[in-house]
């Protein structure tokens, strides 16, 4: 139903009024304001920004705006003992050192408190040894090295290029391979788009630019010292040896000028194939060690960073619902940045700020949403999604009973080509319907809908005439809401053309060059893409908070469940003999999916026909919709990942950024041919099929008639 049927709404106060109030010029102004100094988590500057946002959200008209603080484990370089990597000769003399900081961008030379590039949560250490080049340090890269090339990384320092997968997975893989240190670098093949100049003359990464980032493997735990519980004043903290997800070997990031000096001397094995070669003028030899003339030289890391329990601050704003105040729609994005945060996160925070302002304007005119809207400015996202996770841990009982939806609002742009959406299938129809009502900002699509330009530029691989919508993975603040609590979630941003730009993310990601000027000069001078993202994010929140019947379509879940069941079955069928030997059957899963499909169809029919003027029946139907996502949660979690509890989706065990479907079954099948005990391994596959089938069936039954 359209939003303007909600209670206490005059025709003036509909979605159009909300959308018309959003202004590109305001987003631009807010972005400038948020990006003039660094806002690193745990610093005074970021606390001051939290207080500023609190004050402004109050001025905008929210009912209440509070700071929620937690004391969590963060990581910082030692100010007097910098981190660097050396090439040392046989006498131990340092003949080359990597850079201590990035050359500052023009106009920012005198800015203080720019944290130098570092890998957050790296342990201290000064390992020295031979180098091994491990490509992207993916699972398959180590398989190639160890199984095909018979190269042993044990006791070696590995050098890996950034890209393809989350850096924490790279470090985990290197640890498992026995490495004693990891060097991460940005290769121009992945972070320098052909035909574009380096910053400040374009949006490419200069040779001195370096990507910061955490290297944790938290698997949804939040603060490493207080997994499962909020890091509050009376928290019991684990010892550092028992902390969740910390790396055990030193790690440090470098730019491609420094990487050139390390890689140009590499000897040993040649790269196995062209997919291991980047764009530097080096041989990309795998090693181990340097070539003939330089064989006595070694690499030495000098890492002195410290882990410190530090106070962080979330800003939580509330706009109370007029009809269902105990139903929460949440819009959240982080505030902390590695340096200036020109894209990550402030392009998102500026959009949230303008959405709050627009909602506040409507509220000041007497309007209220049907349901409560919560707005969040999260802290310490860059250190492992800590602010959002701690808040959700503290409020988990309320959220699991009252949480309708969570819309994430990190970077609004990672390109300016087309829309990119990742969300629960429950939101597919909401996103489709909304984007059909919005104007496309794209050149060549004047007067056309956003849906049309998006579908043309990013078509669905399965359904013609529809746009691609991806699975939710992780690496952002929706994680705890979706993967742990089972609250329907979604995210939207403008992205690049993935077909023509093969680099990973955007080139200046997490570098000092992510400035206001980067956005204003090169990505979105008119802020029209930011405005479109504000309309999508804000429009989703508006509909979720205001429509009489929740805008979720359970039939779309049925469709994807069948697709995911087919996919996992075909993976398993690569081992037909073992499936026969161990009596592995997917019948229960396909039966459950069939039941889900039939029950969802009947539920949708009832949804069309029920008496919407009966508040009890309306609430009952809406609760069935709200709790459907919750029904996919297994309270026991996935094997060895207790905080990833969603049975249909989890972050990939090989790449935190990517979503995996039926992750329990997928992980049980992964590399099963190499397992020492096939009987046990296939037994686990059968158990995971059972868990998945049961969960899908149980979820289906939540949509059945209640009596």
């Amino acid at each position: 139903k359209s939003s303007n049927e909600a209670t206490n709404i005059t025709p003036k106060h509909n979605m159009k009024a909300f959308l018309d109030e959003l202004k590109a010029e305001n987003i631009k102004k807010f972005l400038y304001n948020f990006t003039q100094i660094p806002h690193l988590a745990g610093t005074e500057q970021n606390f001051q920004l939290a207080k500023q946002i609190q004050s402004q959200w109050k001025e905008f008209g929210l009912d209440s705006v509070e700071l929620a603080h937690y004391d969590v484990l963060l990581s910082y370089p030692n100010k007097t003992h910098p981190n660097y990597i050396s090439i040392i000769n046989e006498d131990g003399n340092e003949i080359f050192n990597t850079s201590l900081f990035e050359p500052p961008p023009p106009g920012y030379e005198n800015v203080s408190d720019i944290v130098p590039p570092f890998s957050a949560f790296s342990p201290q250490g000064m390992p020295e040894g031979d180098l091994v080049y491990v490509n992207y340090a993916r699972t398959e890269d180590f398989f190639k090295l160890e199984r095909d090339m018979k190269i042993n990384c044990s006791g070696k320092i590995v050098i890996a290029r950034y890209g393809k997968v989350f850096r924490g997975n790279k470090v985990k893989n290197a640890q498992l391979a026995g490495a004693k240190g990891v060097i991460l670098y940005s290769d121009p093949a992945d972070y320098f788009a052909p035909g574009v100049k380096s910053y400040p003359d374009g949006w490419n990464l200069p040779g001195g630019g370096v990507q910061r980032g955490n290297i944790l493997n938290l698997n949804g735990a939040g603060d490493p010292l207080t997994p499962g519980y909020p890091a509050n004043e009376y928290a019991y903290r684990r010892g550092i040896a028992e902390a969740v997800g910390l790396p055990s070997i030193p790690v440090h990031p470098i730019g491609y000028y420094d990487a050139q000096k390390l890689l140009e001397k590499m000897g040993g094995s040649a790269p196995p194939d062209s997919s291991w070669r980047g764009s530097l003028k080096v041989p990309y030899n795998v090693g181990p060690g340097f070539t003939g003339n330089f064989s006595t030289q070694k690499v030495k890391m000098h890492i002195h960073s410290t882990n410190e329990v530090t106070r962080i601050y979330n800003v939580i704003g509330t706009l109370r619902g007029a009809v269902e105040p105990d139903r929460y729609v949440i819009l959240g994005g982080h505030r902390d940045s590695w340096v200036f945060g020109g894209i990550d996160p402030q392009s998102g925070a500026a959009v949230v700020h303008e959405i709050v302002r627009s909602f506040g304007t409507l509220k000041k005119e007497g309007w209220r949403p049907r349901r409560t809207i919560l707005f969040a400015s999260w802290d310490a996202e860059e250190f492992g999604l800590l602010g959002s996770t701690e808040w959700a841990e503290e409020n988990s009982r309320l959220l699991q009973e009252r949480g309708v939806a969570y819309i994430n609002a990190d970077s609004s742009i990672e390109g300016n080509y087309t829309l990119r959406v990742d969300c629960t299938p429950l939101m597919y129809s909401l996103v489709h319907n909304l984007t059909k009502e919005l104007k496309s900002p794209d050149e060549g699509f004047e007067g056309k809908s956003l849906y049309e330009s998006w579908t043309k530029k990013s078509p669905s691989p399965e359904f013609s005439g529809m746009p691609r919508i991806s699975k939710l993975g992780s690496g952002n603040d929706f994680e705890v809401f979706f993967q742990r609590l089972g609250i329907a979630s979604g995210r939207a941003r403008y992205t690049k053309n993935w077909e023509t730009n093969k680099f990973s993310g955007y080139p200046l990601y997490h570098s000092v060059y992510e400035t206001y000027e980067l956005v204003e000069k090169f990505y979105d001078p008119m802020f029209k893409y930011h405005l479109t993202v504000a309309q999508v994010r804000g429009g989703m929140v508006f509909e979720l908070a205001n429509s009489i019947v929740l805008p979720f379509d359970c039939r779309d879940y049925a469709v994807v469940l069948r697709k995911y069941a087919d996919k996992i079955y075909s993976i398993s069928m690569k081992h037909p003999q073992e499936m026969k030997t161990y009596s592995v059957s997917f019948d229960s899963l396909f039966s459950a999916v069939k039941n889900f499909t039939e029950i969802a169809s009947k539920f949708s029919e009832r949804l069309q026909d029920f008496d919407k003027s009966n508040p009890i029946v309306l609430r009952m139907m809406n609760d069935q919709l709200m709790f459907l996502e919750r029904a996919f949660i297994d309270p026991l979690g996935l094997p060895d990942r207790p905080f990833y509890r969603h049975v249909i989706y989890a972050p990939s065990s090989h790449n935190k950024y990517a979503g995996e479907s039926f992750p329990g079954i997928y992980d049980a099948l992964f590399d099963i041919e190499s397992k020492v005990d096939p009987s046990k391994a296939w037994g686990e596959v059968k158990r995971q099929i059972y868990v998945a089938a049961f969960t899908v069936q149980a979820a289906a039954e939540t949509l059945s008639e209640v009596a």
Epitope: F96, P103, P104, E109, G207, G208, G255, Y257, D258
Partner: nanobody, 123 residues
Framework: EVQLVESGGGVVQPGRSLRLSCAAS????????MNWVRQAPGKGLDWVAF????????YYADSVKGRFTISKDNSKNTLYLQMNSLRAEDTAVYYC????????????????WGQGTMVTVSS
């Protein structure tokens, strides 16, 4: 206007010390590698020393290694060359020169030169 101005040259006895300065204007020293180059009377140019933009790498010609020290003060936008144990063969015009590339890790092509300062080592 982008320019480099050297100072601190003069006549000095062998074995003594001298400190050259190079004041940069029109660009931030913090972003560029810097070099000292010298030209002895009637000879060609000789590279003397390099310091990376961040100070992490310093390289010296073999002839001055252990005697000369290159440094810079980013807050003053000034490059220095501390010359100890001076010898007659150090007599030359000393030029400071800016690396062409932001963030270069080793000496690259030089795009801005100073006018030079004369150092004479003589008893």
């Amino acid at each position: 206007e982008v320019q480099l101005v050297e100072s601190g040259g003069g006549v000095v006895q062998p074995g003594r010390s001298l400190r050259l300065s190079c004041a940069a204007s029109g660009f931030p020293l913090i972003s560029y590698g810097m070099n000292w180059v010298r030209q002895a009377p009637g000879k060609g140019l000789d590279w003397v020393a390099f310091i990376s933009y961040d100070g992490s790498n310093k390289y010296y010609a073999d002839s001055v290694k252990g005697r000369f020290t290159i440094s810079k003060d980013n807050s003053k936008n000034t490059l220095y060359l501390q010359m100890n144990s001076l010898r007659a063969e150090d007599t030359a015009v000393y030029y400071c020169a800016k690396d062409r590339i932001v963030g270069a890790r080793v000496p690259d092509a030089f795009d801005i030169w100073g006018q030079g300062t004369m150092v004479t080592v003589s008893s």
